[in-house]
């Protein structure tokens, strides 16, 4: 007897983090034997949509014309072949930005930092929020989360980095969010350029758990160090 059908691959274009009002296309890729594709959204009546495969039948397209809060969430897809339905795909988390006003991102003591020294990136929101995210441009896995304990609302989060190396240099933005839906983020902060000077061959930090933040073959881990921030937020790694 044949084993279970392989699970399809699910992805979003242009990406899974979409600004309010922008369009997004969700693709589900199965096999050439697929006869039908189905997309389910968590906490929505199933199926969210069904589509016939596009030639050569190994994938289907699901579309969102203009991103709103209602589309944010977790999706899975399946395909049906002559022998039955496939396993579900790995989940796709579709995140909408623009749900809240943008926070302010600053560097303490300065965005100009010498290699080996310390710097703290500070993300501040006008209204109290319970989750803050730091993103580095062109990062492979860019999300650094700070989430408050017990839903406590905070106006800011600190992302300390020490010791700073050349890999920490680059452009950062931050977002804020409420815990009731981590699929809804604020507008992005204005970009902050962190400039690291005085190093050619810096020692690289080697944390046990890291978030990769540089793109391509230069991928290096970025692990803010130091104590849990004063704001009462605990570090949460995605």
């Amino acid at each position: 007897q044949a084993g279970p059908l392989p699970k399809p691959t699910l992805w979003a274009e242009p990406g899974s983090v979409i600004s309010w009002g922008n369009s997004v296309t969700i693709w589900c890729q199965g096999t050439l034997e697929a006869r039908e594709y189905r997309l389910d959204k968590e906490e929505s009546p199933a199926p969210w949509d069904r589509q016939n495969p596009l030639e050569p039948k190994n994938k289907a397209r699901f579309s969102i014309p203009s991103m709103t809060e209602d589309y944010a969430g977790r999706y899975r897809c399946y395909y049906r072949s002559p022998v039955g339905w496939s396993q579900p795909s790995d989940p796709l988390e579709l995140v909408m930005t623009g749900a809240y006003s943008k926070p302010t991102l600053s560097a303490l003591p300065s965005p100009l930092v010498t290699s080996g020294k310390s710097v703290t990136l500070l993300c501040q929101s006008r209204s109290p929020m319970d989750t803050f995210l730091l993103i580095k441009e062109r990062a492979a896995h860019p999300l650094l989360h700070l989430r408050s304990e017990h839903g406590a609302q905070q106006h800011q989060a600190e992302f300390p980095m020490s010791p700073v190396t050349s890999v920490h240099g680059g452009t950062y933005r931050c977002f804020s969010s409420h815990g009731f839906s981590h699929y809804l983020l604020s507008h992005p902060s204005d970009p902050l350029e962190l400039i690291v000077s005085g190093s050619l061959e810096d020692p690289r930090p080697s944390p046990t758990r890291s978030v990769s933040t540089a793109a391509g073959p230069e991928d290096q881990p970025l692990m803010p160090t130091g104590s849990v921030p004063h704001s009462g937020l605990r570090r949460h790694w995605e």
């Epitope: 309010w20 009002g21 922008n22 369009s23 296309t25 997309l39 969210w48 949509d49 069904r50 589509q51 397209r61 699901f62 579309s63 969102i64 014309p65 203009s66 709103t68 209602d70 589309y71």
Partner: antibody, heavy 121, light 108 residues
Framework: EQSVEESGGDLVKPGASLTLTCAAS?????????MCWVRQAPGKGLEWIAC????????RWYASWPKGRFTISKTSSTTVTLQMTSLTAADTATYFC?????????????WGPGTLVTISS | ELDLTQTPASVSEPVGGTVTIKCQAS??????LAWYQQKPGQRPKLLIY???TLASGVPSRFSGSGSGTEFTLTVSDLECADVAAYYC??????????FGGGTEVEIK
């Protein structure tokens, strides 16, 4: 052959309500479509009213000018309605149903012939 | 609320001439702009989508350009069959499908 057709246009008095229906043929609604209503007063330009996503009934988009008087709804996998209340002479127009299509970057690729709504005492 | 300002309101050119219609958005809409042709007494017809892509069956005399807030529709080698009203439209960006005010094209 895919098509849409409007019905329900009528002559009604100011203050009345009216429901227009758009019936799709040759296709059924899915996430790759939105169904939209557009109107055109005599001798005037096109005016967008509302759109609804083919699968997500929570996602309805309205122009600001109807100020809650118009409601777009999906009543089946091939029909959409436009409920209009508190009608005035300014709502006299031909009302078009049109399909917004992901293949055309959400442009309105398929239009009905229109249905005439006249508001007069 | 997004506004689309279309100019001119009307234009008259001889057969074989070129008509240029501009559409300005009050905020950036990327390339989410469509152009429509509506002949007297008929339903509108999609001419161009994604700012510059011709819909199927549309002659190459029609062309669209622009992105962000400034867009242009050009009709070259004008024919009598091109007499119509032309409309620009934001196609769903920022949750609106708003139209411009329209341009009447006539033959001189």
């Amino acid at each position: 052959e895919q098509s849409v057709e409007e019905s329900g246009g009528d002559l009604v008095k100011p203050g009345a309500s009216l429901t227009l229906t758009c019936a799709a043929s040759g296709f059924s609604f899915s996430s790759t479509y939105c169904m939209c209503w557009v109107r055109q007063a005599p001798g005037k330009g096109l005016e967008w009213i509302a759109c609804i996503h083919g699968v997500s009934t929570n996602n309805r988009w309205y122009a600001s000018w109807p100020k809650g008087r118009f409601t777009i709804s999906k009543t089946s996998s091939t029909t959409v309605t436009l409920q209009m209340t508190s009608l005035t002479a300014a709502d006299t127009a031909t009302y078009f149903c049109a399909r917004s299509d992901t293949d055309y970057e959400w442009g309105l690729s398929l239009w009905g012939p229109g249905t005439l709504v006249t508001i007069s005492s | 609320e997004l506004d689309l300002t279309q100019t001119p309101a009307s234009v008259s050119e001889p057969v074989g001439g070129t008509v240029t219609i501009k559409c300005q958005a009050s905020e950036s809409i990327g390339s989410r702009l469509a152009w429509y042709q509506q002949k007297p007494g008929q339903r509108p017809k999609l001419l161009i989508y994604k700012a510059s892509t011709l819909a199927s069956g549309v002659p190459s005399r029609f062309s669209g350009s622009g992105s962000g807030t400034e867009f242009t529709l050009t009709v070259s080698d004008l024919e009598c069959a091109d007499v119509a009203a032309y409309y620009c439209q934001c196609a769903g960006q920022s949750s609106t499908w708003a139209f411009g005010g329209g341009t009447e094209v006539e033959i001189k």
